[in-house]
């Protein structure tokens, strides 16, 4: 029986050109997490695998950073980034848990800001 639950950052907004942290947290299960996938609609953004570490999809390499933790940071946001994002936890023996986040990228300066990065 799948007893776990996923808590997400829910519906969030961010400013165009800024950055945002997407986070999911799996709790209430002793199942072993083997992989976490981050997807935007049907596009794979990133994977964190127990044995292989992080893999960022080539098309998002310049704008996606892993972390903090198992979260994902989106940078240089555009209005086209508005939409649904999914965290998919692969666990053993429970199976798959999925969390949903809706991101709205705003033109105004009312939105939240994510983490700041230094890129060499």
């Amino acid at each position: 029986m799948m007893t776990g639950t996923i808590e997400t950052t829910g519906n969030i907004s961010a400013e165009k050109g800024g950055s945002i942290i997407l986070q999911c947290h799996l709790s209430s299960t002793t199942a072993q997490v083997t992989q976490v996938n981050w997807e935007q609609q049907d596009q794979l953004l990133a994977i964190c695998n127990a044995d292989l570490g992080w893999h960022i999809s080539p098309s998002f390499k310049d704008r996606v950073a892993p972390g903090p933790g198992l979260g994902l940071t989106l940078q240089s946001l555009t209005v086209n980034d508005t939409g649904e994002y999914f965290c998919i936890y692969h666990t053993y023996p429970d199976g798959t848990y999925t969390g949903r986040i809706f991101l709205e990228v705003l033109e105004s300066s009312v939105a939240e800001h994510g983490a700041r990065f230094q890129i060499p």
Partner: antibody, heavy 117, light 107 residues
Amino acid sequence: QVQLQQPGSELVRPGASVKLSCKASGYTFTSYWMHWVKQRHGQGLEWIGNIFPGSGITNYDEKFKNKGTLTVDTSSSTAYMHLSSLTSEDSAVYYCAREGLYAFDYWGQGTTLTVSS
Amino acid sequence: DIVLTQSPATLSVTPGDSVSLSCRASQSIRNSLHWFQQKSHESPRLLINYASQSISGIPSRFRGSGSGTDFTLIINSLETEDFGMYFCQQSNSWPYTFGGGTKLEIK
């Protein structure tokens, strides 16, 4: 198997700088965060910062922003921390630690840095 | 920055006892809390990740629980090899932070 190799000790003069190394093996270096942690004698652990070798992205604790600089050499799978303007307060054990799906799952043995004239 | 407060600072116990170590966060960190053991002159060792996830190779007497701001590490039937320092650490947001530690010593 995963290994993070650090020199055992470094002795430097006050005011000088030092570059501590952490050589990784047994895994894909560019796919995991590398963190640096400070521990003064018999005290707690302090997070200095991290670097993602795949992109060079870094994060620092504000306290260490003007003290340490993190870099990597992906060709040799080595992470470095450059510490400048050293004082006796910088004398400590410095650890590197890998973070993946299972948090800080592997640690180096630590480098004991002694700042003394 | 998120501050992690560990209590007690020191715990004197007898082998065979069971103990609870506490770690409290200054704000919610969901379940992004990890526990480490450190023995004298050794590197820290990961015991529990994400509040309650067991780690391969770590004895089952180590158990973690909690979410949000309050977390507990329970060690059942203490063995002599369990004495040392225990630290909690959060990875909910940068900068990552550690608790001040709990020293587990033999009574």
